[in-house]
Interface confidence: low
């Protein structure tokens, strides 16, 4: 496998000629320092490219921007800078694209030294723009109401919260001294405010406010707030506990009307909580260790976000740059990859196939030798380079890649040994969601998935100019090269339409062709390589998570198994833009592994039964449900969130009645009598990386 045109690989006939006829080059009359790309709408073919050249002079930045627009997936661009009156656009705010296919675009202008600002807005996919004056200077990118793209929310550099209901024409100030604001469900806005101070100090004294009517009325839903985050159906807040500098996580599933204290360790000033991933079923929560260790513990929640099971110890999450390798493998349900910091300070990759239930090392690729980090040359694992390696400036141009519609495919840089190596990595591919791996390409590459996995494209990472692209039509087994230009370019990035449904890839870089250092893009359309549409015969049945075909329960993960129709590796055809993943689920019988241990219970090592925690015997549960006096009854087991098993094992046992009178009412948190059950932590930095690196929330 994965021989670059090895013995078993025969190239596609006439590929060069087909690609040459579908290669479109555009030289930009532009020498700007940076370029931002944005796809406007899904399947529209519209791309906006904003180039920015800026120079800081004393306390201000001067610069110029150019705006280009393509309607053909990047094959040609038109200079439409005149639509924004040649205004300098703030590249740090980027191009704000409206939700769904609204066709809305917002560009925020830099109006240095003024008390207001200016935005350029488009409702027609960037064909035309109108400018609107703002009565404030935005602090960050203006955000759209996900359910009504005419309604915009903005935070000003004076920490005022502003709202527009008519796509930026008119603005009203909602609130002062707002530190963080986010859209919730159904037009709800959540924000933290400091009624008697600023956002830079007194961070644990914030109020969490909610408005459901665009600012006509407000409700304080929580007090003594340090930070808050939204993930799936859950609203999380870290709240000062009344015990000095400690804070604890509280969770609400009804938009803040009622709260419960999450059964998680409290954290101190130098620690942090971070939601690694969340959906409507559950959440992965990282809790930092005390001290500057660079690691913490991953906990997974129950369906209420209240009870947490320890999932992974020594989880790498640096406090300095806020880097974690936690990656949701979107091409297979239940799969996540991350890194741990071992006792000897080496970094190792771990993978879970069951949503954090069990973590294991990645299986060694069959066509690879163990490197110098391996104590035993026959036994080692694959270790994946992700955000942390990139932040450490290792020769890793890209994080791991997977796409929901390219079932089972995971592509990543890695090394084979006992731990991540600082040596130059190779590129590895898995076609079964991370169970098995194969070396795909020698050395570091940029890569992308096209046509729902029908084509994988790669470009070698090199400091020299490049003019060759590699592509594979068989999930990375065999590779062909195509020289897309005689003039090598200094490569800056691969761009393809999000969603991996397109057959176009754009290669961006700069060239010294006519002038020195001009932006240039080459867009290659692979439609003639995949000449025909795929038919039924091109697909084969594949059972996900299959590890033992003899076992009746083979493939059962979270209570059900799924069979997929997958493109045969030998088929060279188009899945097409409208391709929908075909899968057939079947329910599995329940086993004890389909249940997590409820609060007050734990699983001893190598045992699937839940037993009562000895240290809680004779203790009241420090745990409040629904913010009122509640009888807490449990039999020790709770179905894992998202688990669909039926029948089989039903862990029936005596229901224990764990009484505790308590008030987990945020409006008077001093009434809470919450003892800490340990500690976890992080940077406490002000950066809210709600979407960065797909981390849902970092305090």
């Amino acid at each position: 496998r994965s021989t670059e045109q090895g013995e078993s690989c025969s190239g596609l006939l006439g590929a060069d000629a087909k690609l040459a006829g579908n290669t479109h080059q555009h030289i930009f009359n532009d020498l700007s320092g940076s370029v931002s790309l944005a796809w406007v709408g899904d399947g529209t073919g519209v791309i906006l490219a904003l180039t920015t050249f800026q120079v800081p002079i004393f306390m201000i930045t001067i610069g110029q921007s150019k705006l280009y627009r393509s309607e053909d997936y990047g094959k040609s661009f038109e200079d439409v800078t005149n639509l924004i009156n040649n205004t300098f656009i703030r590249s740090d705010f980027g191009i704000a694209i409206g939700p769904e296919n609204s066709g809305k675009v917002i560009l925020t202008a830099d109006v240095s030294g003024s008390h207001g600002s200016r935005i350029f807005v488009s409702s027609d996919f960037g064909k035309s723009f109108t400018h609107q004056e703002l009565p404030f200077v935005p602090l960050m990118q203006i955000t759209y109401n996900p359910e009504n793209s005419n309604v915009l929310l903005a935070l000003s550099n004076k920490n005022e919260l502003w709202l527009s209901e008519d796509f930026g024409t008119n603005w009203k100030k909602l609130y002062d001294t707002v530190c963080l604001a986010k859209w919730g469900r159904k037009g709800t806005i959540f924000f933290t405010a400091n009624h008697n101070g600023s956002c830079s100090n007194d961070r644990g004294m914030l109020e969490l406010e909610r408005t459901t009517d665009y600012g006509k009325s407000f409700k304080t839903v929580a007090s003594k707030i340090y930070s808050f985050g939204l993930g799936g159906k859950f609203l999380f807040a870290s709240v000062m506990t009344g015990k000095g500098t400690l804070r604890a996580i509280h969770v609400s599933v009804d938009d803040g009307d009622t709260w419960n204290m999450a059964q998680l360790p409290s954290v101190g000033q130098e620690q942090f909580y971070s939601i690694l991933a969340a959906n409507d079923d559950m959440v992965f929560m990282h809790v930092d260790e005390p001290g500057d260790t660079g690691f913490g513990t991953i906990f997974t929640s129950d369906d209420r976000g209240i009870v947490y099971s320890k999932s992974l110890d020594r989880h790498l999450y640096t406090t300095t740059g806020g880097e974690t390798d936690f990656t949701n493998v979107t091409s297979l349900r239940g799969v996540y990859i991350t890194s741990v910091l071992s006792e000897d300070n080496s970094i190792q990759t771990m993978i879970t196939f069951d949503q954090g239930g069990r973590w294991t090392h990645l299986r060694k690729p069959e066509n690879s030798e163990c490197d110098a980090t391996a104590k035993n040359k026959n036994e080692c694992s694959l270790h994946i380079h992700a955000s942390y390696s990139i932040s450490q400036k290792l020769n890793v141009p890209m994080a791991p890649l997977s796409e929901p519609n390219a079932v089972g495919i995971v592509i990543a840089h890695g090394s084979v040994g006992d731990a991540i190596s600082v040596m130059v990595p190779d590129v590895y591919i898995s076609d079964d969601g991370g169970y098995s791996w194969t070396k795909m390409l020698e050395g570091p590459h940029y890569y992308t998935i096209l046509d729902s996995g029908g084509i994988i494209v790669a470009i070698e990472h090199s400091s020299r100019p490049i003019n060759v692209i590699k592509f594979s039509t068989d999930e990375g087994q065999c590779w062909q090269t195509y020289t897309f230009t005689r003039d090598p370019i200094y490569f800056t990035g691969l761009a393809s339409e999000p969603g991996a449904r397109s057959m176009n890839i754009s290669i961006w870089g700069f060239t010294e062709s006519f002038l020195t250092s001009q932006w240039v893009s080459y867009t290659i359309d692979f439609k003639d390589i995949l000449e025909r549409n795929c038919e039924e015969k091109d697909y084969t049945i594949w059972l996900a998570h299959s590890t033992d075909p003899e076992d009746y329960e083979d493939g059962c993960i979270l209570g059900y198994k799924e069979q997929f129709l997958r493109l045969r590796k030998s088929s060279v055809c188009q899945n097409g833009r409208d391709y929908v993943v075909t899968k057939q689920p079947s329910i599995c019988l329940c086993s004890l592994e389909d249940f997590l241990c409820d609060f007050g219970y734990y699983r001893p090592e190598n045992d699937s039964k839940c037993v009562e925690q000895p240290e809680l015997k004779g203790h009241d549960l420090e745990f409040c449900l629904y913010g009122r006096e509640e009888h807490l009854t449990t039999n020790g087991y709770r179905k894992i969130p998202g688990d669909k098993c039926q029948g089989g094992v039903n862990p029936v046992r005596e229901v224990k009645d764990l009484k505790k009178k308590c008030t987990s009412n945020f409006l008077s948190p001093e009434k809470q009598n919450s003892k800490s059950n340990g500690s976890a932590g992080g940077s406490g930095g002000l950066n809210d990386i709600f979407e960065a690196q797909k981390i849902e929330w970092h305090e």
Epitope: Q64, S513, F514, S517
Partner: antibody
Framework: EVQLVESGGDLVKPGGSLKLSCAAS????????MSWVRQTPDKRLEWVAI????????HYPDSVKGRFTISRDNAKNTLYLQMSSLKSEDTAMYYC???????????WGQGTSVTVSS | QAVVTQESALTTSPGETVTLTCRSS?????????ANWVQEKPDHLFTGLIG???NRAPGVPARFSGSLIGDKAALTITGAQTEDEAIYFC??????????FGGGTKLTVLG
């Protein structure tokens, strides 16, 4: 020292063809886009053709499009201009030039004379 | 097609500072037009002086400088000398039609 030396200019009849050459030295020829520029008898300068550093891209003004072809041989450090279907208005002094963006500066040859007349 | 306009003639004296300008019919000249300035002396002797608005060619005296003044490109000769008497052409780069030359400015240095 940078040098651009043109050759191949001549007297030619309307409809005829001619090939100009430009030998470059003193700089990394293969790293730069090159142009042909002409100066008409009334002393106006007109850009005639441009070719990218590797020779992949060429561009022409409408006045010569389809009649003139610019090419280069980086191994020989030579730039060419193949002119066909010549017209009297193509009469000019033809210069090989390196016109530049922000990080380089321009160089010009000494020119070669083309006269189109019956 | 863009039209590039220069002063047809300017006169200066030795030691004086003189500024030649280059205007574009499409609007303000910007750094993205990469203004080039070329000097023509008798017998078709062309010398590239400035590239990319303000980048002086090797061997060109420091008294020649390029800049943007207002909405025009400019070539300034600080302390003109008699040997600077020549015709000066500017060329502007446009994305849709590449290089466009001005008509040239004949500079006379009264000696």
């Amino acid at each position: 020292e940078v040098q651009l030396v043109e050759s191949g200019g001549d007297l030619v009849k309307p409809g005829g063809s001619l090939k100009l050459s430009c030998a470059a030295s003193g700089f990394t020829f293969s790293s730069y886009g090159m142009s042909w520029v002409r100066q008409t008898p009334d002393k106006r300068l007109e850009w005639v053709a441009i070719i990218s550093s590797g020779g992949s891209y060429t561009h022409y003004p409408d006045s010569v499009k389809g009649r003139f072809t610019i090419s280069r041989d980086n191994a020989k450090n030579t730039l060419y201009l193949q002119m066909s279907s010549l017209k009297s208005e193509d009469t000019a002094m033809y210069y090989c030039a390196r016109l530049c963006g922000p990080l380089c500066s321009g160089y010009w040859g000494q020119g070669t004379s083309v006269t189109v007349s019956s | 097609q863009a039209v590039v306009t220069q002063e047809s003639a300017l006169t200066t004296s030795p030691g004086e500072t003189v500024t030649l300008t280059c205007r574009s019919s499409t609007g303000a000249v910007t750094t993205s037009n990469y203004a080039n300035w070329v000097q023509e002396k008798p017998d078709h002797l062309f010398t590239g002086l400035i590239g990319g608005t303000n980048n002086r060619a090797p061997g060109v005296p420091a008294r020649f400088s390029g800049s943007l003044i207002g909405d025009k490109a400019a070539l300034t000769i600080t302390g003109a000398q008699t040997e600077d008497e020549a015709i000066y052409f500017c060329a502007l780069w446009y994305s849709n039609h590449f290089w466009v030359f001005g008509g040239g400015t004949k500079l006379t240095v009264l000696g």
